[in-house]
């Protein structure tokens, strides 16, 4: 039975040209995390595998950094980075947990006033 829950940074905004940390946290389960995938709607960004370590998609190698922890840092943000991001926790014995983050990349002056809030 899957008892865990994923907490995410929810809906976030960031400045064009800046960087942002995508972070998820799995709680309320004793399941072992064996792999975490970071995904966009149509492609994989990165994998953190307990045995194999990090794999960063070549399309993102120049501006994606692993961490902190199981999170992902996106750098040199562009407006095209706006959209959904998913963390997928592969666990044993529970199975797969999914968290969703929506990132909006704004022009510098707008981002300063951008609200940050968490989706439960």
């Amino acid at each position: 039975m899957m008892t865990g829950t994923i907490e995410t940074t929810g809906n976030i905004s960031a400045e064009k040209g800046g960087s942002i940390i995508l972070q998820c946290h799995l709680s309320s389960t004793t399941a072992q995390v064996t792999q975490v995938n970071w995904e966009q709607q149509d492609q994989l960004l990165a994998i953190c595998n307990a045995d194999l370590g990090w794999h960063i998609s070549p399309s993102f190698k120049d501006r994606v950094a692993p961490g902190p922890g199981l999170g992902l840092t996106l750098q040199s943000l562009t407006v095209n980075d706006t959209g959904e991001y998913f963390c997928i926790y592969h666990t044993y014995p529970d199975g797969t947990y999914t968290g969703r983050i929506f990132l909006e990349v704004l022009e510098s002056s707008v981002a300063e006033h951008g609200a940050r809030f968490q989706i439960p």
Epitope: E39, D42, Q43, I47, H55, S59
Partner: antibody, heavy 119, light 107 residues
Amino acid sequence: DVQLQESGPGLVKPSQTVFLTCTVTGISITTGNYKWSWIRQFPGNKLEWIGYIYYSGTITYNPSLTSRTTITRDTPKNQFFLEMNSLTAEDTATYYCARETVLRVFDYWGQGTTLTVSS
Amino acid sequence: DIVMTQSHKFMSPSVGDRVSITCRASQDVGTAVAWYQQKPGQSPKLLFYSASYRYTGVPDRFTGGGSGTDFTFTISSVQAEDLAVYYCQQHYSSPRTFGGGTKVEIK
């Protein structure tokens, strides 16, 4: 339980357009994070992904088929559709609809509908 | 597009045999490979995702593994009901692409 069921005309003539329907039960096609895909399987068993409509309504096609395909949906009826034009004999295949997860894998499939393009 | 190659089109094990089906990706896909089973007259069924993660209800005699470009799907002790075509699929990027399939026929 999630179920998908395809329906279509079965036989169409070359150069014509076909309209296939996928009826989904057990889950709303607007349920977050899922994509609703069309996949075809040619007589030699080869599988080809055609495209999907996302829960939010955005649509993505296989670039090799973009010019000939249109995917739409009817959310009140919980159906999504594939329209393919300029058909040739090479489009003869079994057409499946499937649910696609965030990981881009297909966890539920319909039984398939056979399309034969022949004069 | 990422090309997925299954080098063996057919395999003919006896009941109880161990069978390994291989799949090669044309570029590094990390662990983003899924495996499907298609029995005669049926639609494909998901068996594994992320190379080694067993989908719900899949028997323990099936295992998946690999990373990078080389992936393996293994049946530790083939049963008569395992007669099917097995496909790999990369779920790394779009368009999603499948291998050509490996047909397992029981001797």
